[in-house]
């Protein structure tokens, strides 16, 4: 399968709002997806949210910090190809994030 | 068109510290990580470490292998960064290379920490020799 | 730490198809970048992001990337084209970057 094509929609200093898109023909497939984020240079943790739709705003986050984000379609297979990872920054709370 | 122009010195005893500043003409100079590069003769190219300035702040990351010994730092006055290796032996000889990303660090949230890089120095070959 | 894994050296004839593969665990995952570097000179940036050229990079070099394998692709190769290849990416794990060991392209005849 193809992976999600991740794309990051909005930000605040406390959140990120990330969507993504996988073909057509293989969303039939899908029953969930799984969105994995952690801290950038925190490897030893990490959280996951799951969400049936093609959206999702991930919350209480730190400002100007940035975020790895990865997408993960769930089938009744098991997992999916897995999208990129992807680095996602928080704005900075003067809103002045680069 | 960003340039970048390197110079340092070429031939350096064991023990000694090998110092190259690497020059940025044209772009903006506090939107990039700011790479270091070698390539000893005949084998393959190595990443150093990187360097950003923005406001008063030097973010660096170095290559675990040579993080002890290495030094990047940066003068936004001139736009220009450097490269301090200490305690340099016979395995430090190779050529030198300064390198800008493709992009700058981060826009409007997306971030590309080790991007590709689109322009290189011309290379400086330094050879450690007693 | 992140390893990547190149053939040492790949062999085409003149208007043949070159593959030179990049060999990293899960590298699906990481955006793959590719150079080409001429004997004395600096390497050149061929293919970014797996599969996107810079400005002024002929549409023969083309790249993909899925599961463990990345892959340059130079379509009718021509004498010119011989030199070494290196791919490059990002270890988020570690935040360090990583180059794979060069692929020496050689053009037959």
């Known amino acids: 399968t193809e992976p999600p094509k991740v794309r990051l929609e909005g930000r605040s200093t406390t959140s990120l709002s990330v969507s993504w898109s996988i073909p057509p023909p293989q969303q039939s497939r899908v029953w969930k997806y799984e969105v994995t984020y952690r801290k950038k240079g925190d490897s030893n943790s990490y959280n996951v949210r799951r969400t049936e739709g093609f959206s999702v705003t991930l919350d209480d986050l730190a400002p100007d910090t940035t975020y790895l984000v990865q997408v993960q379609a769930l089938t009744q297979e098991g997992q999916g190809a897995g999208s990129k990872v992807h680095e996602f920054q928080t704005l900075s709370p003067e809103g002045s994030g680069n | 068109q960003v340039q970048l122009q390197q110079w340092g010195a070429g031939l350096l005893k064991p023990s000694e510290t090998l110092s190259l500043t690497c020059a940025v003409y044209?772009?903006?100079?506090?939107?990039?990580?700011w790479s270091w590069i070698r390539q000893p003769p005949g084998k393959g190219l190595e990443w150093i470490g990187e360097?950003?300035?923005?406001?008063?702040?030097?973010?660096?990351n170095y290559n675990p292998s040579l993080k002890s010994r290495v030094t990047i730092s940066v003068d936004p006055s001139k736009n220009q960064f450097s490269l301090k290796l200490t305690s340099v032996t016979a395995a430090d000889t190779a050529v030198y290379y300064c390198?800008?990303?493709?992009?700058?660090?981060?826009?409007?949230?997306?971030?590309?920490?080790?991007?590709?890089?689109?322009?290189w120095g011309q290379g400086t070959m330094v050879t450690v020799a007693s | 730490s992140y390893v990547l894994t190149q053939p040492p050296s790949v062999s085409v004839a003149p208007g043949q198809t070159a593959r030179i593969t990049c060999g990293g665990n899960?590298?699906?995952?990481?955006?793959v970048h590719w150079y080409q570097q001429k004997p004395g000179q600096a390497p050149v940036l061929v293919v970014y992001d797996d599969s996107d050229r810079p400005s002024g990079i002929p549409e023969q070099f083309s790249g993909s990337n899925s599961g463990n394998t990345a892959t340059l692709t130079i379509s009718r190769v021509e004498a010119g084209d011989e030199a070494d290849y290196y791919c490059?990416?990002?270890?988020?794990?570690?935040?360090?970057?990583?180059f794979g060991g060069g692929t020496k392209l050689t053009v037959l005849g």
């Open positions: 390198a800008k990303p493709l992009r700058p660090h981060c826009t409007n949230g997306v971030c590309y920490s080790g991007d590709a890089f689109d322009i």
């Open positions: 899960n590298i699906g995952s990481k955006n």
């Open positions: 490059q990416v990002w270890d988020s794990s570690s935040d360090h970057l990583v």
């Open positions: 360097v950003n300035h923005r406001g008063s702040i030097n973010y660096n």
């Open positions: 044209g772009g903006s100079f506090s939107d990039y990580y």
